[in-house]
Interface confidence: medium
């Protein structure tokens, strides 16, 4: 089990003490810093290399806490700017006891399991934000901005990280077509700490659970286990999953025999991942051998090209990657329907997306 | 117990220069972001600037940038405000926040800021 | 010039329920969470509502605060005399990448 948060507790003791006995406050930085705040160098730097071992020693269980990546960061960070040596001696490991009074803010204790209010009480801004989203054939949106048209079958991840893992199943949108649509999704919350038990999320065409696998709507019994919940207020069409403790929103929609995947997540989150997990489609969009071009649909149906661009209009009247990928769905499909992914899409981007100006993405092909 | 004591104001000829600062106690400063707020007499509350917990990012209104700088100094406990070129419209009290939560959670009482000649 | 909108006053008697709102754009309360300031004459600001909903401790609960897309709501139920101050919202604006203020709302007890 990890256990950051006994090195991260023996680094606040052993830093108080050096302070005479101090307030308490956030890990990162946690000396107060320095020469002449009470804090001799040597004895912080005898505290940072402890702590420094500490999470060293514990770092195997640790792949993936928020907390723990925090605190590696910080230690390194602090020891820069106290220009401590990485060899050197260590802090005594600090006694036992009661429990440190907060600082008296009248806000509660620094939330572990409130991505968003921990990061803006430390930078002073909230954080930043990326957008990823696959519907229709499916075409996905990275958090690039790349917009691919996308023929892969079977299993693909669209994000698989140090948090998150989230997989696309796909099929044949019809006999001999060269498109795919996603039927089934299947994302893993990986277990953090004092926040959540891993939770696994499966959704399959005609089958939306407001409910996690085992049953449950939120992150389990941990103390931070509201910090991840899922509702609806369109039951059998769509799914919102907030996972507040990795600034994370999710929204599953269907439309048209299809499911659509939309996030909003905090770019650390997003980009806590190692070379061994390269294959993302959020990340790098669809690999160049897995990419449709515009001009390769196969019509199926009585919808002309112009019919399906009316129908496209209605509800996406910027001629824009999601208007052209409406098209190429309406086409391919034969399907009216088809309009209404495309039109969710761009309705979860206006909402997630940080940046308004990149809404519209207008594909070269 | 968390206290914010803000000093430096007074009065300045436009053009002139003042640097402000903001004693902090009762809580580990380099673990909080801060920022200086302004409020003109009789007027509402402006942001002026902001700064991490490290001191690394910095952030300004358009209104004063390039004109004044925060900074801080986590050994001492104490925030900056260095405001140089001062204009008319820069007559304000001054309060120093601490950022808690997303939240401006503790203020010190205020600096007058005179910008007159 | 504040980027958020309140109304300039409000008044009610005691024991009423008053609203204030704030209205503001994609990029600040669209997008962030709002916090909302109290401020007597003469005295600095206090935190009185934060994230949107969320009371520090110590303020008492006839204060609430929500939002629904570009706009929040703060709600003074039960107004007492002590109440009488200048309530502000505030957000981090991603466009400006700063803090925006309301303009300020002056409540009146009559």
């Known amino acids: 089990q990890c256990k950051i948060l006994r090195c991260n507790a023996e680094y606040v003791s052993s830093t108080l003490s050096l302070r005479g006995g101090g307030s308490s406050g956030a890990l990162r930085g946690g000396g107060g810093g320095g020469r002449g705040g009470g804090v001799g160098s040597g004895g912080l730097c005898r505290a940072l290399r402890s702590y420094a071992l500490c999470t060293r020693r514990t770092a195997r269980t640790c792949r993936g806490d928020l907390a723990f990546h925090s605190a590696v960061h910080g230690i390194e960070d602090l020891m820069i700017q106290h220009n401590c040596s990485r060899q050197g001696p260590t802090a005594p490991p600090p006694p036992r006891g009661p429990a440190l009074p907060g600082a008296g803010s009248g806000l509660p204790a620094p939330d572990p399991c409130d991505y968003e209010g921990r990061f803006s009480r430390l930078h002073g801004r909230p954080p930043g934000f990326l957008h990823c989203a696959s519907f229709g054939d499916p075409h996905v949106r990275s958090f690039h901005h790349h917009f691919h048209t996308c023929r892969v079958q079977g299993a693909w991840p669209l994000l698989d990280n140090d948090f998150l893992f989230v997989q696309a199943t796909s099929s044949p949108m019809a006999l001999g077509a060269n498109a795919t649509a996603t039927r089934k999704l299947t994302i893993i919350f990986k277990n953090m700490q004092e926040c959540i038990d891993q939770k696994v999320y499966q959704a399959e065409v005609d089958n939306l659970p407001v409910a996690f696998e085992d049953g449950s709507i939120n992150g389990g019994d941990r103390p931070g286990g509201s910090s991840l919940s899922i509702q609806t207020a369109n039951p059998g069409n769509h799914v919102e999953i907030q996972a507040a403790y990795i600034g994370t929103t999710i929204i599953i929609r269907q439309t048209a025999g299809q499911l659509s995947f939309s996030i909003k997540v905090a770019e650390d989150v997003a980009m806590a991942f190692s070379a061994e997990q390269d294959l993302q489609l959020c990340v790098g969009g669809c690999p160049p051998s897995q990419r449709l071009s515009r001009s390769e649909r196969n019509r199926r149906g009585a919808i002309t090209i112009d019919t399906a661009r009316r129908l496209c209009k209605e509800g996406l009247p910027v001629e824009d990657a999601y208007f052209h990928s409406c098209v190429f769905d309406v086409l391919i499909s034969g399907d009216p329907n088809f309009t209404v992914a495309a039109q969710a899409a761009l309705e979860d981007a206006r909402a997630f997306l940080p940046d308004l100006e990149k809404l519209h993405l207008f594909p070269s092909d | 117990e968390v206290q914010l004591v803000e000093s430096g104001g007074g009065l300045v000829q436009p053009g002139g220069s003042l640097r402000l600062s903001c004693a902090a106690s009762g809580f580990t400063s380099s673990s909080y972001a801060m920022t200086w707020v302004r409020q003109a007499p009789g007027k509402g509350l402006e942001w002026v600037s902001g700064?991490?917990?490290?001191?690394?990012?910095?952030y300004y209104a358009d209104s004063v940038k390039g004109r004044f700088t925060i900074s801080r100094d986590n050994s001492k406990n104490t925030l900056y405000l260095q405001m140089n070129s001062l204009r008319v419209e820069d007559t304000a009290i001054y309060y120093c926040?601490?950022?808690?939560?997303?939240?401006?959670?503790?203020w010190g009482q205020g600096t007058l800021v005179t910008v007159s000649s | 010039q504040s980027v958020l909108t309140q109304p300039p006053s409000a008044s009610g008697t005691p024991g009423q329920r008053v609203t204030i709102s704030c209205s503001g754009a994609?990029?600040?309360?669209?997008?962030?969470?709002v916090n909302w300031y109290q401020q007597f004459p003469g005295m600095a600001p206090k935190l009185l509502i934060y994230?949107?909903?969320q009371r520090p401790s110590g303020v008492p609960d006839r204060f609430s605060g929500s939002k629904s897309g570009t706009s929040a709501s703060l709600a003074i139920s039960g107004l007492q005399s002590e109440d009488e101050a200048d309530y502000y919202c505030?957000?981090?604006?991603?466009?400006?990448?700063?803090?925006?203020f309301g303009t300020g709302t002056k409540v009146t007890v009559l």
């Open positions: 505030a957000a981090w604006d991603d466009s400006l990448n700063g803090y925006v």
């Open positions: 926040a601490r950022q808690g939560y997303g939240a401006h959670d503790y």
């Open positions: 994230s949107n909903n």
């Open positions: 994609s990029s600040n309360v669209g997008s962030n969470r």
């Open positions: 700064i991490s917990g490290s001191g690394e990012s910095t």
